[in-house]
Interface confidence: low
Amino acid sequence: LQDLCSNCPAGTFCDNNRSQICSPCPPNSFSSAGGQRTCDICRQCKGVFKTRKECSSTSNAECDCISGYHCLGAECSMCEQDCKQGQELTKKGCKDCCFGTFNDQKRGICRPWTNCSLDGKSVLVNGTKERDVVCGPSPADLSPGASSATPPAPAREPGHSPQIIFFLALTSTVVLFLLFFLVLDYKDDDDK
């Protein structure tokens, strides 16, 4: 009998109670492999789930989440409510990210802004609830006489052109020179 059962293809089950050994899976059930003694009940996509793929005699139904929710877990075993960018889902619903954190997706948690100083860089663009900070060149790169080797271009939000970086470098150079002359002038006054 075991040999006969192994001949039953996917979409059927080995029915010992009938003379016809291989019986088709009843409605709303499936068998994805051959030689099965029972068919599995199809998954039903109800409530916050909606059907992505209908159940067939050989494969289970696949569920998705209805609008306003997203899938969690293996094979979309759970649906979790969407939040908007700049928020995270808590037990009390969607809450704005705290200062110093951001979330650029409709799911997940708020993450801390990148600490540019850890990489020896300066903050080029401030962070928001929806976006991480953009790190610019390190302060040393902006000072006169610094190596001319250009560092890799930082990730930029649209609208932050290289001209801004150049302007920042130029401004800081001018400020340094002004400070230099102020100090000299102050020393001259002292000498008098």
């Epitope: 909606k50 209908e54 609008s67 306003g68 928020q87 409709k106």
Partner: antibody
């Protein structure tokens, strides 16, 4: 208990815009979505759009160019604005809460009867 | 858009009867269908979602069935307070669409 109260004008001039405020009580807008639906003798019930608890919106494609839904969670208010109204926009406009079980409407506002006429 | 057709505009019934209101979707909507009740002068309420799940507080004489394109709302042992208009709605895809309604009247 759960309530949705609507306020807005009854008469709108053609080509003008319609603004309705839906003030909710008995639940938080940070946990529930709010739909907008209208009912007219000619077209029956028409779904217009929804604002989800997180603030994201979905609109009926037929109205997307002239419809805006927003909200103020702290004031428990949802705002509906539709531009360029014409005579066939004459209808009763409803706001309704979306429960946590499915994309349906479990509590409805009392409705705002809107007539578009000069 | 998915069209939800309720072919019967009116249905006559008597208290204690069993009555079935039908709704047909223009394309497969799985089980993503809800049923609403609208009593004269009252707010609309949801009875059934996911084709067969009763919403909280709905009496068990209301039963939903169907999947794919054909759906039925059955009221067994009709009560006088059940005389109302019934609407179906699909939420399988946007835009959400409603049936035209079926009014339940006394014979």
């Amino acid at each position: 208990q759960v309530q949705l109260k609507q306020s807005g004008p009854g008469l709108v001039q053609p080509s003008q815009s319609l603004s309705i405020t839906c003030t909710v009580s008995g639940f938080s807008l940070t946990s529930y979505g709010v739909h907008w639906v209208r009912q007219s003798p000619g077209k029956g019930l028409e779904w217009l759009g929804v604002i989800w608890s997180g603030g994201s919106t979905d609109y009926n494609a037929a109205f997307i160019s002239r419809l805006s839904i927003s909200k103020d969670n702290s004031k428990s208010q949802v705002f509906f604005k539709m531009n360029s109204l014409q005579a066939d926009d004459t209808a009763i406009y409803y706001c309704a809460r979306n429960p946590l079980t499915a994309t349906v409407m479990d509590y409805w506002g009392q409705g705002t009867s809107v007539t578009v006429s000069s | 858009d998915i069209v939800m057709t309720q072919s019967q505009k009116f249905m006559s019934t008597s208290v204690g009867d069993r009555v079935s209101v039908t709704c047909k979707a223009s394309q497969n909507v799985g089980t993503n269908v809800a049923w609403y009740q609208q009593k004269p002068g009252q707010s609309r309420t949801v009875l059934i979602y996911s084709a067969s799940y009763r919403h909280s507080g709905v009496p068990d004489r209301f039963t939903g069935s169907g999947s794919g394109t054909d759906f039925t709302l059955t009221i067994s042992n009709v009560q006088s307070e059940d005389l109302a208009e019934y609407f179906c709605q699909q939420y399988n895809s946007y835009p959400l669409t409603f049936g035209t309604g079926t009014k339940l009247e006394l014979k």
